[in-house]
């Protein structure tokens, strides 16, 4: 029942061009190139894309034409390797061009940079943006794709087309509005925040596939789809998992045309078979393609079937437990995961995967024992502490969040994580802790039944950001250990880390704590980041500082900024009062 075309095409590039249409084809090739060559100027990429598109058109006209039978990796790789400044701009990535496919593509993939050295995107004035949009709409939208793709080299390409469509709609509507800024800015903020979240979620999918393999991704997908589609039978869920795995494997592997094409096919299949999948799909399936795919990916969980029987009968009490496990391990474990997940929309996916792993480990041991049934009879009792651990953690942290508010909750996490892994760079600690802190506003408002899936699965996404950033420049064995040992136990691994007693405190540097009048013109968010950067540095200097000491210093710092920003001669105030603050802080912390 596979939805994907198995027939061979004489020309793969012609096949994809015809399936996707010229507009999507060009957009996806641009995304692919920008995700591979993240430093190349926009104009260079547009030129390469136009050349590929013209070539694709010749193949559509005649599939037997020269080079039309080549694979997409060969065609795209050859095109990327024509870039004149490859060695100067990318260094050893240029060595990829000496390799043959498929090694060349693997080489390009390995050089994708999660934290490229690119300037922060600064939003121009609304009138400037509207003029640019009206002057050349096509270039304006291509520039958006390019800028997002190069900064987010694993962004889910078909979803980026959906973002671009919304971006275009925002400008089309708001550039005609009476108050352009009031109309446009909230929409752009929403797109930016959703885009960052989408990028991080996809990064976890790619890390799961690339670092832990297809089996790990499939297990994640079985659990999530079973929660979402609890009325669907296991065979249906398995089929969706197989197809979804293919889609994400392609996108994570840089095969963006195949990925977008197969995602469209999967959406079509789901909508044609919604009666046997979920009652919640009706509205999604009435939408155009990009909206439809996005809507399906975000669709709410269907209601659980009534009167689902206890799992114990089939998975503990049955005489055939070990026979099933021996005959088809992964199918049997998949069935267990499906049955458990459809009954527990209140559990996080990672918790469900931990339970499945515990069940697997128990069967592995017990099915080789003298009395297997006696050995595994109490396996469900082992689940209790695994369930209670995230429940308690979420309860405690939501209480702390409600007590402190988001900013101070982030600060508590900044201190906590800096003490756990002080070797990690300050920008990474600030970024990750700020995102960890957002779990409060995102999830604590939910009722009990929705808190755990919201919180723990979100934390998995954020901790993966830490893992991919740390992998680029590894500095902490503890981070490496938590990131690589088990995908589903990353969060418990980080939670269990105590203060790193081996850490040698950083030398005090007054420059780190020197501030200038420019802080006064920053947005509230940027000002918070400055203060949080200082907080991390404080902890790195004095890892044994108490909460009270740190709070006192931070309160003094906030008062200092507020005072100097109100002063007539701000710069003098920052210079003089700053010295006093540093001295007072050193005394308070015993530096």
């Amino acid at each position: 029942r596979g939805v994907f075309r198995r027939d061979a095409h004489k020309s793969e590039v012609a096949h994809r061009f015809k399936d996707l249409g010229e507009e999507n084809f060009k957009a996806l090739v641009l995304i692919a190139f920008a995700q591979y060559l993240q430093q190349c100027p926009f104009e260079d990429h547009v030129k390469l894309v136009n050349e590929v598109t013209e070539f694709a058109k010749t193949c559509v006209a005649d599939e037997s034409a020269e080079n039309c039978d080549k694979s997409l990796h060969t065609l795209f790789g050859d095109k990327l390797c024509t870039v004149a400044t490859l060695r100067e701009t990318y260094g050893e990535m240029a060595d990829c061009c000496a390799k043959q496919e498929p090694e060349r593509n693997e080489c390009f993939l390995q050089h994708k940079d999660d934290n490229p050295n690119l300037p922060r995107l600064v939003r121009p004035e609304v009138d400037v943006m509207c003029t640019a949009f009206h002057d050349n709409e096509e270039t304006f939208l291509k520039k958006y794709l390019y800028e997002i793709a190069r900064r987010h080299p694993y962004f889910y390409a078909p979803e980026l087309l959906f973002f671009a469509k919304r971006y275009k709609a925002a400008f089309t509507e708001c550039c005609q509005a009476a108050d352009k800024a009031a109309c446009l800015l909230p929409k752009l903020d929403e797109l930016r925040d959703e885009g960052k979240a989408s990028s991080a979620k996809q990064r976890l999918k790619c890390a799961s596939l690339q670092k832990f393999g297809e089996r790990a991704f499939k297990a994640w997908a079985v659990a999530r789809l079973s929660q979402r589609f609890p009325k669907a039978e296991f065979a249906e869920v398995s089929k969706l998992v197989t197809d979804l795995t293919k889609v994400h494997t392609e996108c994570c592997h840089g095969d963006l045309l195949e990925c977008a094409d197969d995602r469209a096919d999967l959406a079509k299949y789901i909508c044609e078979n919604q009666d046997s999948i979920s009652s919640k799909l009706k509205e999604c399936c009435e939408k155009p393609l990009l909206e439809k795919s996005h809507c399906i990916a975000e669709v709410e969980n269907d209601e659980m079937p009534a009167d689902l029987p206890s799992l114990a009968a089939d998975f503990v009490e049955s005489k055939d437990v070990c026979k099933n496990y021996a005959e088809a391990k992964d199918v049997f474990l998949g069935m267990f995961l499906y049955e458990y997940a459809r009954r527990h929309p209140d559990y996080s996916v990672v918790l469900l995967l931990r339970l499945a792993k515990t069940y697997e480990t128990t069967l592995e041991k017990c099915c080789a024992a003298a009395d297997p049934h006696e050995c595994y009879a109490k396996v469900f009792d082992e689940f209790k502490p695994l369930v209670e651990e995230p429940q308690n953690l979420i309860k405690q942290n939501c209480e702390l969040f409600e007590q402190l508010g988001e900013y101070k909750f982030q600060n508590a996490l900044l201190v906590r994580y800096t003490k756990k892994v002080p070797q990690v760079s300050t920008p990474t600690l600030v970024e990750v802790s700020r995102n960890l802190g957002k779990v409060g506003s995102k999830c604590c408002k939910h009722p009990e039944a929705k808190r755990m899936p919201c919180a723990e699965d979100y934390l998995s996404v954020v901790l993966n950001q830490l893992c991919v950033l740390h992998e680029k420049t590894p500095v902490s064995d503890r981070v490496t250990k938590c990131c690589t040992e088990s995908l589903v136990n990353r969060r418990p691994c980080f939670s269990a880390l105590e203060v790193d007693e081996t850490y040698v405190p950083k030398e005090f540097n007054a420059e780190t704590f020197t501030f200038h009048a420019d802080i006064c013109t920053l947005s509230e968010k940027e000002r918070q980041i400055k203060k949080q950067t200082a907080l991390v540095e404080l902890v790195k200097h004095k890892p044994k500082a108490t909460k009270e000491q740190l709070k006192a210093v931070m309160d003094d710092f906030a008062a200092f900024v507020e005072k100097c920003c109100k002063a007539d001669d701000k710069e003098t105030c920052f210079a003089e009062e700053g010295k006093k603050l540093v001295a007072a802080s050193q005394a308070a912390l015993g530096l």
């Epitope: 079937p305 029987p309 055939d320 088809a328 049997f332 069935m335």
Partner: nanobody, 123 residues
């Protein structure tokens, strides 16, 4: 606990067709292997066909190409479409189920059984 109830049996001329249906109650059996067995007077109960969770099917050589086993998840049923019937197909047909990934062919491996439905093929 799973209860199985067969229906659709009856008398038919050789060369004719019948469709047997097996309705499960007590729980959904889509993950279960389901099988059809038959017992002619004075003979051992024998395997006819089986289907597993992903609709992989197996058949006894004597019915291959003539009988089709299928399942419908929404209705929690398993069916046996019997075509080109022969007098030697006359028997009581039983539906059986077991929670197994790979559908067994031997009756002793099945946990749940229906009461049976009579099929008579006259020449």
């Amino acid at each position: 606990q799973v209860q199985l109830n067969e229906s659709g049996g009856g008398m038919v001329q050789a060369g004719g067709s019948l469709r047997l249906s097996c309705a499960a109650s007590g729980r959904t059996v889509s993950n279960y292997a389901a099988g059809w067995f038959r017992q002619a007077p004075g003979k051992e109960r024998e395997f006819v066909a089986a289907i597993n969770w992903n609709k992989t099917t197996t058949y006894a050589d004597s019915v291959k190409g003539r009988f089709i086993i299928s399942r419908e998840y929404a209705k929690n049923t398993v069916a046996l479409q019997m075509n080109s019937l022969k007098p030697e197909d006359t028997a009581v047909y039983y539906c059986a189920a077991v929670f197994r990934i790979v559908a067994p062919k031997t009756q002793y491996e099945y946990d749940y059984w229906g009461q049976g439905t009579q099929v008579t093929v006259s020449s």
